[in-house]
Amino acid sequence: GVFNYETETTSVIPAARLFKAFILDGDNLFPKVAPQAISSVENIEGNGGPGTIKKISFPEGLPFKYVKDRVDEVDHTNFKYNYAVIEGGPIGDTLEKISNEIKIVATPDGGSILKISNKYHTKGDHEVKAEQVKASKEMGETLLRAVESYLLAHSDAYNEQKLISEEDLGGEQKLISEEDLHHHHHH
């Protein structure tokens, strides 16, 4: 069966800037700003467009070791991103894939709304585990807020037509120091 879960969440970050950081450069940004949630993102095949396969690895202590995502659509004009979780994590005997749609919509106050749709494609009559839906939502929220905190702390980042560089994330300006990681992410 197919089980659809839709959520909306707001952000103070303008839609174009959030799309650049959260969607287009998430692979680079997530392990830097949320290492407690994602340890690495590896491009298996493709150049970021439809058909691209990515392997997202999780740090020790989380329920799953990795997932593989397939990019289905990247719409730069409408700030829309569709992808599917096709391997690893919860995918297995009872779950075939999870199709995800993220649309970032500008709001009149200069912020944005993220409209998220998660379709769980189960095998046969199997239902979706509530814990899985909750964990997935929490992961998304963690990543979004970590990216927001970075963008609020670095006024220039992703404001122009450039993605963040290693240099921008390094030195005194990196968001999370080793000391901070020790204090805040390994309690």
Partner: antibody, heavy 118, light 107 residues
Framework: QLQLQESGPGLVRPSETLSLTCTVS??????????WGWIRQPPGKGLEWIGS???????YYNPSLKSRVTISADTSKDQFSLKLRSVTAADTAVYYC??????????WGQGTTVTVSS | DIQMTQSPSSVSASVGDRVTITCRAS??????LVWYQQKPGKVPKLLIY???SLQSGVPLRFSGSGSGTDFTLTISSLQPEDFATYYC?????????FGQGTRLEIK
Amino acid sequence: QLQLQESGPGLVRPSETLSLTCTVSGGSISSSNYWWGWIRQPPGKGLEWIGSIYYSGITYYNPSLKSRVTISADTSKDQFSLKLRSVTAADTAVYYCAKLEWLRLDFWGQGTTVTVSS
Amino acid sequence: DIQMTQSPSSVSASVGDRVTITCRASQGISSWLVWYQQKPGKVPKLLIYAASSLQSGVPLRFSGSGSGTDFTLTISSLQPEDFATYYCQQAKSFPLTFGQGTRLEIK
């Protein structure tokens, strides 16, 4: 209306730890829209940023104070706190807590005077 | 770190005068500059953000300009309540840094 209020001892002995708390009312420190911070001003001198915290616990500190500073947050109480270790007379100042919107300090507490003296 | 330098450190002026205070950043900060006013024994008050945007409630005689490394705060016609110390602050990224302040005194 958002209000911030600093609290803590007004006198700290040299080499001890200065501890201050900022209580936020009329708003929530759990908002993902803002950072929160501590700033100080020694008598007759300018403003010095000490450090800032995001509701998730991520922190930034002034490099010159980093080895002595810890800022933490208690979202359940809408409070964030400052600890400054191994204080000397040079740490005597008015200490302010503030809300940061896009890195501008748009709401400040009234400030609390901390004197370091034996 | 980005260093902020204000000039002059103090200035004497009379009511009705036009006063300009400058602030220089040690590296480009685009328009990420903030100005504050502080009166003796009082809390700093946000005047201008993003180099030229007036904070709500701030009188129109205050204006800001500049981009990159050089910025100015202008008071077009000084009022008695404007005598205070003014600070600039870069809002590009942490660590936040302030200018040393400019004290505006009555001549």
